[in-house]
Amino acid sequence: PGPPAGSPRVSSDPRADLDSAVLLTRSLLADTRQLAAQMRDKFPADGDHNLDSLPTLAMSAGTLGSLQLPGVLTRLRVDLMSYFRHVQWLRRAAGPSLKTLEPELGALQARLERLLRRLQLLMSRLALPQAAPDQPAVPLGPPASAWGSIRAAHAILGGLHLTLDWAVRGLLLLKTRL
């Protein structure tokens, strides 16, 4: 009769799990792109914004060829956990301006959490170690000003967009090697 409803299915093909992760990543990428556009429309960005607490981009065109599944999944999960914390911080600390984007930020956080759970599941199915971040998470301090919060939001959404973009490419490439 099959497993009870709601229980995780046992997959014999990790490629199916990878497909599912790619789908979720693509969906989150679209959400992020849309929210970043909304941000730019509502609070125009004056140039590029950086945030020291954000992870550095793990992948580039040069490194795509040498990617290995364990490394990609581990790094992606660690980076997305950092972005999850940053989005959470934005929602709670960034001031009234960003509350106007609260439904979208809330949905983004929920989908990020869903992707993180999917990556964790994929790693356990592939018997990969659930690596902890290299260093403990730095507590995110209060924003210096509302203007600073908006700049931080631009940086977070921009960085997440780039990370997800490379994640989709990397995961699709790795799928062909499985």
């Epitope: 709670r92 600390a93 301006s97 210096a144 600073g148």
Partner: antibody, heavy 117, light 111 residues
Framework: QVQLVESGGGVVQPGRSLRLSCAAS????????MHWVRQAPGKGLEWVAV????????FYADSVKGRFTISRDNSKNTLYLQMNSLRAEDTAVYYC??????????WGQGTLVTVSS | QSVLTQPPSASGTPGQRVTISCSGS????????VNWYQQLPGTAPKLLIY???LRPSGVPDRFSGSKSGTSASLAISGLRSEDEADYYC???????????FGGGTKLTVLG
């Protein structure tokens, strides 16, 4: 140092209007969201309104919605509160306050508004 | 009737530790940071604790904040006569789209 100075308070009849101002100095005014908070005589603090750093986002307490308008002029480093259709229950000391996020790190000394016939 | 609930009064003797509670809901304290303000008689309020448990520079470490679920508390240790004031908690409320305050707690330092 950061300074916020409110002005424009006074005695006004019910149904009339009044405009409060808050002159800011000692910081980059255009980088901060600004709030108005009031305190009726012998009572607690009540939040009134907030305006975002560049003026596009505004939120109001239900008790003043449709009657009060918050605005700012970043070129003059000044915050305003236009109060229309004033009622006796609007009698209070009105404070302007600066906020980096959701906490008020600097407050003005307050200006008293008395609504009485 | 305030959205956040505080006891109207609290008291203690010099040197004692006093705690003031602040109770809210999932839409304010449960999902946003809590701040505490001190208002000395006849003066404007002053920020005492922000971001649940952070102290602005100049605020003595006798003052500390904590939060659990939908409740927060302010603790004052080594009570001094100059601590006699009104204390207010506040947070953003996502349902009301605004800042909410507690009704305030009048702290009396006895003796």
């Amino acid at each position: 140092q950061v300074q916020l100075v409110e002005s424009g308070g006074g005695v006004v009849q019910p149904g009339r209007s009044l405009r409060l101002s808050c002159a800011a100095s000692g910081f980059t005014f255009s980088h901060y969201d600004m709030h108005w908070v009031r305190q009726a005589p012998g009572k607690g603090l009540e939040w009134v309104a907030v305006i975002s750093y560049e003026g596009s986002v505004k939120f109001y307490a239900d008790s003043v919605k449709g009657r009060f308008t918050i605005s700012r002029d970043n070129s003059k480093n000044t915050l305003y509160l236009q109060m229309n259709s004033l009622r006796a229950e609007d009698t209070a000391v009105y404070y302007c306050a600066r906020t980096p996020g959701f906490h008020f790190d600097y407050w003005g000394q307050g200006t008293l508004v008395t609504v009485s016939s | 009737q305030s959205v956040l609930t505080q006891p109207p009064s609290a008291s203690g003797t010099p040197g004692q530790r006093v705690t003031i509670s602040c109770s809210g809901s999932s839409s304010n304290i449960g999902s946003n940071y809590v701040n505490w303000y001190q208002q000395l008689p006849g003066t404007a309020p002053k920020l005492l604790i922000y971001y649940d448990d952070l102290r602005p520079s100049g605020v003595p470490d006798r003052f500390s904040g904590s939060k659990s679920g939908t409740s927060a508390s302010l603790a004052i240790s080594g009570l001094r006569s100059e601590d006699e004031a009104d204390y207010y908690c506040s947070a953003w409320d996502d349902s009301l789209s605004g800042v909410v305050f507690g009704g305030g707690t009048k702290l009396t330092v006895l003796g």
